[in-house]
Interface confidence: low
């Protein structure tokens, strides 16, 4: 049989070898694809099959716009003028070239001797899934699980069936090295299809600075607020590169994007709880602030300041 590769959405015509110029009953196509249950038989006299495929006057099979579900096996059997039976057999695969891959959240600088996220390479809309690979100074970068770590994710769109690939590169650069150039390429793995390359990125490498103490600043002071008021929690830490700040409420991480500031506008009792922030620094591990208890009060008659750990009413909590 013959292997055919066709681009999704485009027409595909499969010729029936040995078909007479004016086909008679003696021609049939059999299809076994994602659209069919086992084999589907088509003949020139039959109706076009749901606008998906139809037999042309010359006996060829036309699929006007091929899709993923049309992948499969196509067989034609025809009897020529001499009464000899001729068979044609096709194995059809479809493909879709994605948009040009890009590196999202590229690092502008890396810290020596610690793991750094270089960026995430994203390719959207491929079929089959294909592969993403990273390059350092134009040469393939082989993940070793230590100094070079690649975390890959493949998702399939529930409706289109096309794939989105994500590849996150983490490296541990050495001190005193040259400025590295990273790039990423997507390959479908099909013959005669060249890889698609991203624009290169050139993060600079700098020496690490250890983090200093972490502070949780509370506004209003003490963390006690009237309903409808605003509470601002600010996590302050000095480190290079700046760590990611996540927030914890009642012992549970809040599902928010990392940010050094947590704003609670128009607070109600649902905002009450024990808050702390966690600074994650690759070379020094996570650092958690002292917690603060946020209380919403109707009366303003509080006794001790509920927001401070020691009851002194101080709004600044330092480690």
């Amino acid at each position: 049989g013959q292997n055919i590769t066709a681009r999704i959405g485009e027409p595909l015509m499969l010729s029936c070898k040995g078909a007479p110029k004016k086909p008679t009953q003696k021609l049939e196509w059999k299809l076994n694809t994602g659209r069919t249950e086992a084999w589907k038989v088509l003949s020139p006299q039959g109706d076009p099959w749901d606008s998906v495929a139809r037999i042309l006057p010359n006996g060829s099979l036309l699929l006007p716009a091929i899709g993923i579900v049309d992948e499969g096996t196509f067989r034609c059997r025809a009897t020529n003028r001499l009464g000899k039976e001729v068979k044609s057999n096709y194995r059809v695969r479809v493909y879709q070239i994605p948009g040009k891959p890009e590196i999202v959240n590229p690092a502008s600088e890396l810290t020596a001797n610690v793991p750094n996220k270089v960026g995430t390479c994203v390719s959207e809309g491929s079929y089959p899934a294909g592969t993403l690979s990273w390059h350092l100074d134009g040469k393939p970068l082989i993940p070793d699980g230590k100094g070079t770590v690649v975390k890959e994710e493949t998702r399939r769109h529930p409706e289109t069936g096309l794939f989105t690939l994500r590849s996150e590169l983490t490296v541990t650069p050495a001190q005193g090295g040259t400025t590295p150039t990273y790039s990423c390429s997507f390959s479908l793995g099909l013959p005669r299809r060249r890889p698609l390359n991203t624009a290169p990125i050139q993060p600079r490498v700098r020496e690490p600075l250890p983090p200093e103490g972490i502070q949780l600043l509370v506004e209003p002071e003490g963390g006690t607020v009237a309903p409808g008021g605003t509470v601002t929690l600010t996590c302050a830490i000095s480190a290079q590169p700046p760590p990611q700040i996540h927030w914890i409420k009642d012992g549970t991480p809040l599902p928010l994007a990392p940010s050094p500031v947590l704003l609670l506008p128009e607070v109600g009792h649902e905002d009450e709880g024990i808050y702390s922030c966690v600074a994650t620094h690759p070379s020094h591990g996570p650092q958690e602030s002292p917690p603060v208890n946020i209380r919403v009060t109707e009366t303003g008659d509080e006794g001790q300041a509920a927001g401070s750990v020691d009851g002194s009413g101080l709004g600044t909590l330092a480690l």
Epitope: K249, D250, G251, E270, G273, P290, P291, V309, L319
Partner: antibody
Framework: DVQLQESGPDLVKPSQSLSLTCTVT?????????WHWIRQFPGNKLEWMGY???????NYNPSLKSRISITRDTSKNQFFLQLNSVTTEDTATYYC????????WGQGTLVTVSA | DIVLTQSPASLAVSLGQRATISCRAS??????????MHWYQQKPGQPPKLLIY???NLESGVPARFSGSGSGTDFTLNIHPVEEEDAATYYC????????FGGGTKLEIK
């Protein structure tokens, strides 16, 4: 004021599933906090079972992980406990509670596992 | 799992005296500055009631004769002066790496 109320059968046969409901009033379970199930055995030992976070994620006591499921119905402001393959050792008072420091609890419901 | 060990298991204190209950964690339950340790009081037929949160903070509505202290792995609940209504079982609980409770201390008033 926040109130929690447990409900469900008070008698379950061994090997069956125990299902309890916690109805929360005065606060939306999708607004904040984690919502927990805790049980207290006849000897008064307290055991944390698991929680459902307001985001919908769950976390379970490792000793129960293979048997426990906590789900919710946000339209009714309820969350649920299902404990499978119960034995007589699952006889306890089951409480639902709110948050990391458990400032709010239900009154508890005694569930007896017996043939 | 972090294991919490409470001592003593039971305690009899005269009216007006001090009651001290200890709770030891198998590993640290907080930062160097504060700890995710909480104390509860439970009376028969009732759910536990929060007394102290974050090791030393008094829950609103709880009398000032209750106090909590400690950090890292060792924590203490003090009641002074003890009153008759304080007869109950007291539990420590942490909210670090999931949650566990201590075994409880039964306080009896002499």
């Amino acid at each position: 004021d926040v109130q929690l109320q447990e409900s469900g059968p008070d008698l379950v046969k061994p090997s069956q599933s125990l299902s309890l409901t916690c109805t929360v009033t005065g606060y939306s379970i999708t607004s904040g906090y984690s919502w927990h199930w805790i049980r207290q055995f006849p000897g008064n030992k307290l055991e944390w079972m698991g929680y459902i976070h307001y985001s919908g994620s769950t976390n379970y006591n490792p000793s129960l992980k293979s048997r426990i499921s906590i789900t919710r119905d946000t339209s009714k402001n309820q969350f649920f406990l299902q404990l499978n393959s119960v034995t007589t050792e699952d006889t306890a008072t089951y409480y639902c509670a709110r948050g990391g420091d458990f400032a709010y609890w239900g009154q508890g419901t005694l569930v007896t596992v017996s043939a | 799992d972090i294991v919490l060990t409470q001592s003593p298991a039971s305690l009899a204190v005269s009216l007006g005296q001090r009651a001290t209950i200890s709770c030891r964690a198998s590993k640290s339950v907080g930062t160097s500055d504060s700890s995710y340790m909480h104390w509860y009081q439970q009376k028969p037929g009732q759910p536990p009631k929060l007394l102290i949160y974050l090791a030393s903070n008094l829950e609103s509505g709880v009398p000032a004769r209750f106090s909590g202290s400690g950090s890292g792995t060792d924590f203490t609940l003090n009641i002074h002066p003890v009153e008759e209504e304080d007869a109950a079982t007291y539990y420590c609980q942490h909210s670090r790496e999931l949650y566990t409770f201590g075994g409880g201390t039964k306080l009896e008033i002499k």
